[in-house]
Interface confidence: medium
């Protein structure tokens, strides 16, 4: 669809005569008609069949004519077509003598005429006019025209229909070739399509305008590129939507049991190792001069009753001091200035003279223990406890208290490890004397059966055309992340072309 | 369709022992978090125990733990609950369950019945 | 022993509004999201809503629910006869390492 314009400039009749010779009373008062046709070799009578247009009395013999196209007036002439400009015509402009107001063509008489001109050619879609002067005996008329495309319509022909728009099927301008220029923002074939916030994950984000980025479920973040871990996940991230991968030192459904109480904790006191043993379980490794669960009493070197033959202990800050009864002497007491004559042995001890009278020993009575049978027997002296247990005197009987993991009268028993059912997926769990061992299922591996190695459901690839495959565990199915061009609920169609435009 | 259908259900001995089997389709099983809940005759529910996606993380109510393990075979699409040592409180209808991402159950299976009894 | 509480029984005529509730404490409810199930006699329970107050497709939007601090409640609008159920609302308890029950509410329609 287009316009074939064509400006009347100037016509000159300085005789004031018509065709046929006959001069006009008192002037010849003219007006022109225009016929467009299809291009013809000879141009001939017969149907105007691009146009006709008349004009009304533009003047008296010779005149300029104005141009009128700003005031709304009729020059240049519009003839408007809807089909595609073919690029040939045929023009016929013929001047004509208006003896009165009447200007159709019945009511002039045939001899009206002034004169006709007949063009024909290629005339090509553009701005510019073309200005032609056609001359005859008599008259002289000078004109310009072209073909220009009506609102709307672009291209060599006129025949590429755009009008811009800015709604849900189109944000966008025209090009002078009729082709689309998206808004700012908007991209795509009819630029429908919004263009994400710079970054926005092209799998995991979408927008339905520009600069925005959507999440789908199961990520977050202004890029939506990070995962969400599942609901109540305390210490435990993921790589993919809705896991629960525990971070180092914590176990459980939700990462939330703490298996390295010793980083966590620090129950270990006066400097002492500590070592995991389990969840929320540790042993602590005392230094020298500390006891206890966690190493919290310190330990009187005195204890251990290291004063023989009845000495006296006394703490220092870097040891201990024995203070010997007469006749003795020693770092100990463990030296004799006595024999057997000074009735050395107490609590009904033997006294055996030694090396000629130089010395002497006792021989102690049940229950008494000592060079001079000095000390009841300390039942904890023959370390009775297995397995690093603490002995405790209790008057005539001891106990022992067992570290963790072991227990009995002498903290002989390990507690067993498969107590705890460490082997996953119905894993048969073995106590060993060093730990426990896992007989594994069919489809299963690893030191506690954590490894799967069944198939992964998702290796059927449900999705087509590299899309990512994961599942929304809020719907009933994977999900198939379609890239850029595909869609469907597997990706499998690829973005077709309208069948029409879809104004 | 997305369906569970829970089997294995039947009348046992105390101390004996019994096997659930829990079969899913119509969803991807591997991806789901999943869970089996009890509901003891004219009572409320229970959650029983829960398994990982991948099945490296199991949690029991603290009334079932050391006697019940829950299991899956992802290339099966089946889930377990092997109970041992059974009681009389643990009478009830078992359901089997996927757990959604925000600890909801979104797709139950038809029950199954399990009596302890003498 | 449930540990969230709620009122053994409501009821309500058609075309009502009845809010059932539900208490917890701060390693139940005030920690984690709370899910609504609804069962009907005889049938397996069915999700109602979740994370606080998501209906999942298919529940209309006459459910809804609510959550401030340690208590949640579930709403339900235009009450119909086909809502006389068991509602039970849920929750983890990162103190129990486990999810519990409410008690359970009978919901009459008159």
């Known amino acids: 669809s287009g316009v074939f314009q064509l400006q009347l400039q100037e016509f000159i009749n300085e005789r004031g005569v018509l065709a046929s010779g006959r001069p006009c009373e008192p002037g010849c008062r003219t007006f022109f008609r225009v016929c467009l046709k299809h291009f013809q070799a000879v141009v001939s009578p017969g149907p105007c069949t691009f146009g006709t247009v008349s004009t009304p009395v533009l003047g008296t013999n010779s005149f300029a004519v104005r141009d009128d196209s700003s005031g709304g007036g009729r020059n240049p002439l519009q003839l408007p077509f809807n089909f595609t400009w073919p690029g040939t015509f045929s023009l016929i402009i013929e001047a004509w003598h208006a003896p009165g107001d009447d200007l159709r063509p019945e009511a002039l008489p045939p001899d009206a005429l002034i004169s006709k001109i007949a063009i024909q050619g290629s005339l090509a879609v553009g701005q510019n006019w073309l200005l032609d002067e056609q001359t005859s005996t008599l008259t002289r008329l000078r004109y310009s025209y072209r073909v220009i495309c009506s609102d709307n319509y672009y291209g060599d022909n006129c025949s590429r229909l755009c009008k811009k728009r800015n709604d849900h099927f189109g944000h966008y301008v025209c090009q002078p070739d009729g082709n689309l220029s998206c808004l700012p923002g908007w991209t795509g074939e009819y630029c429908q399509q919004p263009i994400c916030l710079s970054g926005c994950h092209e799998q995991n984000g979408y927008c339905s305008k520009p600069a925005e980025c959507l999440c789908r479920p199961g990520w977050q973040g202004r890029l939506c590129n990070e995962c969400i871990p599942h609901n109540g996940c305390r210490h435990g991230t993921c790589s993919t939507p809705w896991q629960c991968t525990c971070d180092e030192g914590w176990g459980g459904l939700f990462c939330d049991q703490d298996l390295n109480y010793c980083t966590h904790h620090s129950p270990c006191k006066n400097g002492a190792t500590c070592s995991n043993s389990g969840q929320r379980s540790y042993t602590c490794t005392c230094r020298p001069g500390y006891t206890g669960v966690d190493c919290e009493l310190e330990l009187s070197e005195c204890d251990s009753n290291p004063c023989r033959n009845g000495g006296s202990c006394k703490d220092q800050e870097d040891g201990y001091h024995c203070l010997c009864p007469p006749g003795y002497y020693g770092l100990h007491c463990e030296h004799s200035t006595l024999s057997c004559a000074d009735s050395p042995c107490f609590n009904g001890g033997s006294c055996r003279e030694r090396n000629q009278g130089a010395n002497y020993a006792c021989e102690c009575p049940p229950n008494f223990t000592g060079s001079n049978c000095e000390k009841k027997v300390d039942r904890c002296t023959s370390n009775p406890c297995a397995n690093g247990g603490q002995c405790l005197n209790r008057g005539p009987s001891r106990m022992c208290r067992c570290r963790p993991g072991f227990t009995g009268t002498y903290c002989e028993l390990h507690v067993s490890d498969c107590a705890r059912n460490p082997c996953a997926h119905g894993g048969t769990c073995h106590d060993l004397e060093n730990g426990l061992m896992c007989t594994c299922p069919a489809g299963f591996s690893g030191r506690r059966c954590e490894v799967r190695t069944s198939i992964d459901a998702c290796a059927s690839s449900p999705c087509f055309n590299r899309a990512t495959c994961y599942t929304d565990l809020s719907t009933d199915t994977f999900v198939c992340n379609c890239p850029y061009g595909f869609v469907g609920s597997r990706c499998e169609f690829p973005v077709g072309l309208p069948p029409s435009f879809p104004w | 369709e997305v369906q569970l259908v829970e089997s294995g259900g039947s009348l046992v001995q105390p101390g004996g022992s019994l096997r659930l089997s829990c079969a899913a389709s119509?969803?991807?099983?591997?991806?789901?978090?999943m869970t089996w809940l009890r509901q003891a005759p004219g009572k409320g529910l229970e959650w029983v125990a829960t398994?990982?996606?991948?099945?490296?993380?199991?949690a029991y109510v603290e009334s079932v733990k050391g006697r019940f393990t829950i299991s899956r075979d992802n290339a099966k699409n089946l889930l377990y609950l092997q109970m041992d040592s059974l009681r009389g409180d643990d009478t009830a209808v078992y359901f089997c369950?996927?757990?959604?991402?925000?600890?909801?159950?979104?797709?139950w299976g038809q029950g199954t019945m399990v009596t302890v009894s003498s | 022993q449930s540990v969230l509480t709620q009122p053994p029984s409501a009821s309500g005529t058609p075309g009502q509004r009845v809010t059932i509730s539900c208490s917890g404490s701060s390693s139940n409810i005030g920690s984690n999201t709370v899910n609504w199930y609804q069962q009907l006699p005889g049938t397996a329970p069915k999700l109602l809503i979740y994370s606080n107050n998501q209906r999942p497709s298919g529940v209309p939007d006459r459910f809804s629910g609510s959550k401030s601090g340690t208590s949640a409640s579930l709403a339900i609008s235009g009450l119909q006869s086909e809502d006389e159920a068991d509602y039970y609302c849920a929750a983890w308890d990162g103190s129990l390492n486990g999810y519990v029950f409410g008690t359970g509410t009978k919901l009459t329609v008159l």
């Open positions: 119509g969803f991807t099983f591997s991806n789901g978090w």
């Open positions: 398994i990982k996606p991948d099945g490296s993380d199991t």
């Open positions: 369950a996927r757990d959604l991402a925000y600890n909801a159950f979104d797709i």
